[in-house]
Interface confidence: medium
Amino acid sequence: ILEAHYTNLKCRCSGVISTVVGLNIIDRIQVTPPGNGCPKTEVVIWTKMKKVICVNPRAKWLQRLLRHVQSKSLSSTPQAPVSKRRAA
């Protein structure tokens, strides 16, 4: 469910939401670290209804969600840093 994506050349998310996305509707989470042309962490959620949502990486509920996902798939999940990039 949680994967890392390292090859973006620019930011994918033009805007983010902070409202909770239920675990039951999540198909996949992608955490992209800063760099490779995008200066900020991006968190993209694919829902089971094939909808793509950009989520605020600072949202507290997302941190809880990542903890939950991590505890379920500790050894098999690629990890990417959830971190902002400083302003140039």
Partner: antibody, heavy 120, light 107 residues
Framework: EVQVQQSGAELVRPGSSVKMSCKTS????????IIWVKQRPGQGLEWIGY????????EYNEKFKGKATLTSDTSSSTVYMQLSSLTSEDSAIYFC?????????????WDQGTSVTVSS | DIQMTQTTSSLSASLGDRVTISCRSS??????LNWYQQRPDGTVKLLIY???RLHSGVPSRFSGSGSGTDYSLTISNLEQEDIATYFC?????????FGGGTKLEIK
């Protein structure tokens, strides 16, 4: 058991380069990153950069761009750091650590470090 | 860069004491704060990540708390093996930065 094991101490000449290694075991190598940290004698810790193995993605502290180069070899689950144009300021202990990036951006397993002494 | 400040560079305490080490960041780091122990032999270990979560294998006498820009590490019942230097580190914004360290000694 997760382990990271670094190469031995280096004594090098000013102006030269050095390449040190960080061999990992006990987890899926391509699923995590390796972080490098510098510690000068009697001083604090300084983040150099990280490498994400799956795609060879790297990120550097601006201060170490052009100084440090991070690479990896998936066949041996090893990460390398090369330091170039060495000066006395580069004399330090260099640590590698596994990146625990699911939250907090912590460094969860460290080795004892590689000591680099730059001297003529 | 975010500056991490550990105002107390050294601290003396007695075995069995409750010890608190503080760390302040120059801006809000959203709880992305980790604590490390460096023993006299140079060995570094992660103790606490994401402000308050205990890393596996770390004794429960260690705890962390804080929010915003102010964070602390508490050792509830100081033992001989806890004699070390403690560093905080922020993982909120690149470049990740460390505090200067607090050296804990026995009275």
């Amino acid at each position: 058991e997760v382990q990271v094991q670094q190469s031995g101490a280096e004594l090098v000449r000013p102006g030269s380069s050095v390449k040190m290694s960080c061999k990992t075991s006990g987890y899926t190598f391509t699923n995590y990153g390796i972080i490098w940290v510098k510690q000068r004698p009697g001083q604090g810790l300084e983040w150099i950069g990280y490498i994400y193995i799956g795609k060879g993605y790297t990120e550097y502290n601006e201060k170490f761009k052009g100084k440090a180069t991070l690479t990896s070899d998936t066949s041996s689950s090893t990460v390398y750091m090369q330091l170039s144009s060495l000066t006395s300021e580069d004399s330090a202990i260099y640590f590698c650590a596994r990146g625990a990036h699911y939250y907090g951006n912590a460094m969860d397993y460290w080795d004892q470090g590689t000591s680099v002494t730059v001297s003529s | 860069d975010i500056q991490m400040t550990q105002t107390t560079s050294s601290l003396s305490a007695s075995l069995g004491d409750r010890v608190t080490i503080s760390c302040r960041s120059s801006q809000d780091i959203s709880n992305f704060l980790n604590w490390y122990q460096q023993r006299p032999d140079g060995t570094v270990k992660l103790l606490i990540y994401y402000t308050s979560r205990l890393h596996s294998g770390v004794p429960s006498r260690f705890s962390g708390s804080g929010s915003g820009t102010d964070y602390s590490l508490t050792i509830s019942n100081l033992e001989q093996e806890d004699i070390a230097t403690y560093f905080c580190q922020q993982g909120d914004t690149l470049p990740w930065t460390f505090g200067g360290g607090t050296k804990l000694e026995i009275k």
